[in-house]
Interface confidence: low
């Protein structure tokens, strides 16, 4: 057989025995001559060098570049490949010689005592037990112990080859401590040497780097990276690191096995990379690879090296954040810095502490943003080493979708007297203010008599055919007033009013307000009745503990049996076709009330008096009257709202101020409460008296001091009082400059 590629000028060495395989008997002499075109050498089995005593290599007598190999009295162990080759080349000729020794059919290894085979428990791996044969066609089996098991070649995954040995799937013998090959020749058994079985693991479960990410250092600091490999038992691990700067003088690698708990099914290996003083060139990706021979796993981390400790805001740090009421707001402090800075958040100068509604950390999170969260938030980053500080202001604007104030107040069944002029109002609060408020209408019967439409409590008006109020044909004559802006409960609100010049037809009116973040609407049932009329005495919403009377007036010639009822607490049942005054047909939901009857020349008046009204008295009151002729019942409903008593509060602060002599001071003090509080002003705890220079306007809300003098300096107090108590705010006014002397002195 030939080995290597023939070069242009050299032929392969030529052997005297022109065969690939030669079979000879033991105790005979093996002699092969090799001829070539330059210096030759021989290699033979077992001892692959020229030191074997029994083997003789001699120069041929008949020519240059010729060598004869002679082995007298060959034995089975001389079985193997004999190679003749040109020195310093790959060009060779090979013959495989079997020395048939039936007393020793297996070639013994040089170490003779026993061999070692390394196996893994991998199902797909096979192992070769190197029991080579001196006879090519032996009947060989493999014995494993203990317990004793015999494996016979199956023509598939179990086989024996005289030149290679016994091949078997490794998991089949992984239980065994030792194995050997056995050959049967003429009912005689011959055994190879014993091979000790060593099970070697290969599985790497994971490779973990610590720290795993976000590693930052400044020049000169020490970098320590730990790489831990977790493996199955019987595994040996090689670690290999890749890093940016390979030429580092102060780089140190330490590999060691880590102890695991006894009985653990796992081994741990640790490789520690240390760089004593990092430089900028050490910045980059660090990769640790752990290899078990059959398996490699790796992990990487990025190491950032800064010139020196620093802190700065990232370019994406927002200056304006917009949100809608109820949303979760996240304002991340986007920074570049090493080491990570201490982060402190302030709102309008006041430090923010985390609680269940707000988390002030790397990200400022407001769980459910409300209007009061609007403002300027300052984030201050402090470098913990250099103490360098950076601050950034973020303005948070909280938008409010339109909210219509009266929506929760008005009963869906209010009634209006025929022929009267009525004003419908929508008071809208929205941020930003609504860019439009539109009014729509439709006839009550168009909406109410739509049996196919399902009616719900949230949408008692299933109708969709809304018409613009400009198109009032077939309805009431309407005029929409220009929107007004009013400060109500300390909030800027938009008030839209719609004037119905004569209440002739029952209709539904809808106002719709829209701003950039949403829309709000309110549907008003405008039920026109020719029946009784309800009025309130006094003609305003009562406050708790005040008295109020509800008057029901009906034409005596038309109506009789006037009765007052109150709607029960359960929601008004609404039936399709009966909207919006179903109360007369469903008296079960009403509570009958005691009332006093008065009469004048034309009307009966039924008066129901509430002394010391309470919040429980709020609700829908129904006056029922019966038509004298038809006996048909007519109902009118009036919703009564009782205002809660609220102690006085003053919105906004009085500011200390410094003014020069001769200038003017104007301050205002807005108070709220129910009943409305009285406002009084004091200077240095004495009641402030109006004179030519001191002017109080708008119910004492606004104080003006004209042409201030030195004696106007002092502590000014605004006090708002009602029966529920007082609230006050104070400010000190400093007057600068010298008082000019007047001629009068």
């Amino acid at each position: 057989a030939s080995v290597g590629l023939p070069s242009v000028s050299l032929d392969l060495p030529r052997l005297s025995i022109q065969k690939d395989i030669l079979t000879i008997k033991a105790n005979t002499t093996l002699q092969i001559t090799c001829r070539g075109q330059r210096d030759l050498d021989w290699l033979w089995p077992n001892n692959q060098s020229g030191s074997e005593q029994r083997v003789e290599v001699t120069e041929c007598s008949d020519g240059l570049f010729c060598k004869t190999l002679t082995i007298p009295k060959v034995i089975g162990n001389d079985t193997g490949a004999y190679k003749c080759f040109y020195r310093e080349t790959d060009l060779a000729s090979v013959i495989y010689v079997y020395v048939q020794d039936y007393r020793s059919p297996f070639i013994a290894s040089v170490s003779d005592q026993h061999g070692v085979v390394y196996i893994t428990e991998n199902k797909n791996k096979t192992v070769v037990i190197p029991c080579l044969g001196s006879i090519s066609n032996l009947n060989v089996s493999l014995c494993a112990r203990y317990p004793e098991k015999r494996f016979v070649p199956d023509g598939n995954r179990i086989s024996w080859d005289s030149k290679k040995g016994f091949t078997i799937p490794s998991y089949m013998i992984s239980y065994a401590g030792m194995v050997f090959c056995e050959a049967k020749i003429n009912d005689e058994s011959y055994q190879s040497i014993m091979y000790i079985v060593v099970v070697v693991g290969y599985r790497i479960y994971d490779v973990v780097l610590s720290p795993s990410h976000g590693i930052e250092l400044s020049v000169g600091e020490k970098l320590v990276l730990n790489c831990t490999a977790r493996t199955e038992l019987n595994v040996g691990i090689d670690f290999n690191w890749e890093y940016p700067s390979s030429k580092h003088q102060h780089k140190k690698l330490v590999n060691r096995d880590l102890k695991t708990q006894s009985g653990s099914e796992m081994k741990k290996f640790l490789s520690t990379l240390t760089i004593d003083g990092v430089t900028r060139s050490d910045q980059g990706l660090y990769t640790c690879a752990a290899s078990s021979g059959l398996m490699t796993k790796k992990n990487s981390t990025f190491v950032r090296v800064h010139e020196k400790p620093f802190v700065a805001f990232g370019s994406g740090m927002e200056s304006l954040v917009e949100a809608t009421v109820g949303e979760r707001v996240r304002i991340p402090a986007k920074y570049l810095g090493y080491p990570p800075p201490e982060i402190k958040w302030y709102k309008n100068g006041i430090p923010l502490e985390s609680n269940h509604t707000i988390k002030a950390g790397h990200v400022l999170t407001i769980m459910e943003v409300s209007e009061r969260d609007t403002g300027n938030y300052t984030v201050i980053l402090t470098n913990p080493i250099s103490k360098e500080k950076q601050s950034h202001v973020v303005s948070l604007v909280v938008y409010v979708p339109p909210q219509i104030g009266e929506k929760s107040l008005i009963s869906p069944v209010d009634s209006y007297q025929y022929g009267t002029t009525q004003t419908l109002t929508c008071t809208v609060y929205a941020i930003p203010p609504p860019h439009h408020i539109h009014w729509y209408w439709q006839l009550e019967e168009e909406c109410a008599n739509e049996p196919s439409q399902a009616v719900s409590v949230t949408n008692p008006y299933p109708c969709e055919e809304w018409r613009s109020v400009e198109d009032f044909q077939g309805g009431n004559k309407i005029e929409v007033n220009k929107n007004q802006f009013a400060l109500i409960e300390g909030k800027n609100k938009t008030v839209s009013t719609l004037v119905i010049q004569a209440a002739n037809v029952s209709a539904l009116y809808k106002c719709e307000a829209v701003n950039k973040v949403g829309r709000g609407e309110r549907v008003i049932s405008f039920h026109v009745t020719r029946g009784p009329e309800i009025t309130l005495q006094p003609d305003m919403q009562p406050t708790e503990q005040e008295s109020v009377s509800l008057w029901c007036t009906a034409d005596r010639s038309t109506f009789e049996n006037l009765t007052w009822y109150k709607l029960g607490p359960q929601p008004l049942p609404i039936h399709v076709g009966e909207l919006p005054t179903p109360v007369c047909k469903n008296l079960d939901t009403l509570w009958k009330l005691n009332a006093t009857m008065f009469s004048n020349s034309t009307n009966d008046i039924l008066i129901m008096e509430l002394k010391n009204a309470s919040l429980q008295d709020q609700g829908d009151y129904v006056c029922l009257a019966q038509d004298r002729k038809t006996k048909k019942r007519h109902c009118v409903v009036r919703q009564l709202t009782v205002l809660e008593r609220v102690a006085p509060t003053i919105t906004g602060n009085l500011e200390n101020q410094t003014t020069s002599i001769g200038e003017s001071i104007e301050v205002s003090c807005t108070a709220s409460g129910n009943p409305p509080p009285q406002i009084m002003w004091f200077k240095d705890n004495e009641t402030l008296v109006e004179d030519s220079g001191i002017v109080l306007k708008d119910g004492n809300r606004n104080l003006t001091i004209r042409r201030v003098r030195k004696e106007d300096e002092g502590l000014y107090t605004c006090q708002a009082c009602s029966v529920l108590g007082c609230a006050k705010v104070e400010a000190f006014f400093i007057i600068e400059g010298a008082q000019e002397k007047t001629n009068l002195e």
């Epitope: 990706l285 990487s300 990025f302 990232g314 370019s315 994406g316 954040v321 949303e327 707001v329 570049l336």
Partner: antibody, heavy 120, light 111 residues
Framework: CQSLEESGGRLVTPGTPLTLTCTVS????????MGWVRQAPGKGLEWIGF?????STYYASWAKGRFTISKTSTTVDLKITSPTTEDTATYFC????????????????WGPGTLVTVSS | AVVLTQTASPVSGAVGGTVTIKCQAS??????LAWYQQKPGQRPKLLIY???KLASGVPSRFSGSRSGTEFTLTISDLECADAATYYC?????????????FGGGTEVVVK
């Protein structure tokens, strides 16, 4: 040294999904965001979206539903879910190596681009 | 989304001269604007970020400025190598949008 290289650009028929891959070198994707920008022949640059260091994705309003960005430890993929002829362009992946974290702002490292042609 | 409107192409300048390119934002984006240079068949190159900060390795002949929502890129001491298309890009993320927009581009011709 940080570098980006796009691959996967080829001629596709309309409606055939196509995935482009950006292979990064020297950049830790767990610390940096990566973005995609495209440029139709003879036209200007158009921002598609980016994937943050934590894996959150952000898309231009026109790109939502049309593209999907995902990543492994060393690659960032851009999937064009149902290409149309209007998606014919050179696609660049880009990164800001100076400004790592949740958002991708301006781009100071760009790949050479890969050409996608959508034609029936 | 922010819309960026750039100076119409082309803008011409002589070698050694100065050219300015404007970029108008449709809403407040503060200083969140970058400028890029792109030559035919090449990838874009960052010149300016944060409206006026010079990117590393960019000659000081390039400068950026901001006035409200109008941004300007100025190239002074013009060289032949400056012939390219210049793009502005906003990277302002508001609560309802993460649109990161490029302007339409302005071609600079050097005579």
């Amino acid at each position: 040294c940080q570098s980006l290289e796009e691959s996967g650009g080829r001629l596709v028929t309309p409606g055939t999904p196509l995935t482009l891959t950006c292979t990064v070198s020297g950049i830790d994707l767990s610390s940096y965001a990566m973005g995609w920008v495209r440029q139709a022949p003879g036209k200007g640059l158009e921002w598609i979206g980016f994937i943050s260091s934590s894996g959150s994705t952000y898309y231009a309003s026109w790109a939502k539903g049309r593209f999907t960005i995902s990543k492994t430890s060393t690659t960032v993929d851009l999937k064009i879910t149902s290409p149309t002829t209007e998606d014919t362009a050179t696609y660049f992946c880009a990164n800001n190596y100076d400004d790592y974290g949740d958002f991708l702002h301006y781009f100071n490292i760009w790949g050479p681009g890969t050409l996608v042609t959508v034609s029936s | 989304a922010v819309v960026l409107t750039q100076t119409a192409s082309p803008v011409s300048g002589a070698v050694g001269g100065t050219v300015t390119i404007k970029c108008q934002a449709s809403q407040h984006i503060y200083s969140n604007l970058a400028w890029y240079q792109q030559k035919p068949g090449q990838r874009p190159k960052l010149l300016i970020y944060a409206a006026s900060k010079l990117a590393s390795g960019v000659p000081s002949r390039f400068s950026g400025s901001r006035s409200g929502t109008e941004f300007t890129l100025t190239i002074s001491d013009l060289e032949c190598a400056d012939a390219a298309t210049y793009y502005c890009q906003s990277y302002y993320y508001s609560s309802d949008s993460t649109d990161n927009t490029f302007g339409g581009g302005t071609e600079v011709v050097v005579k």
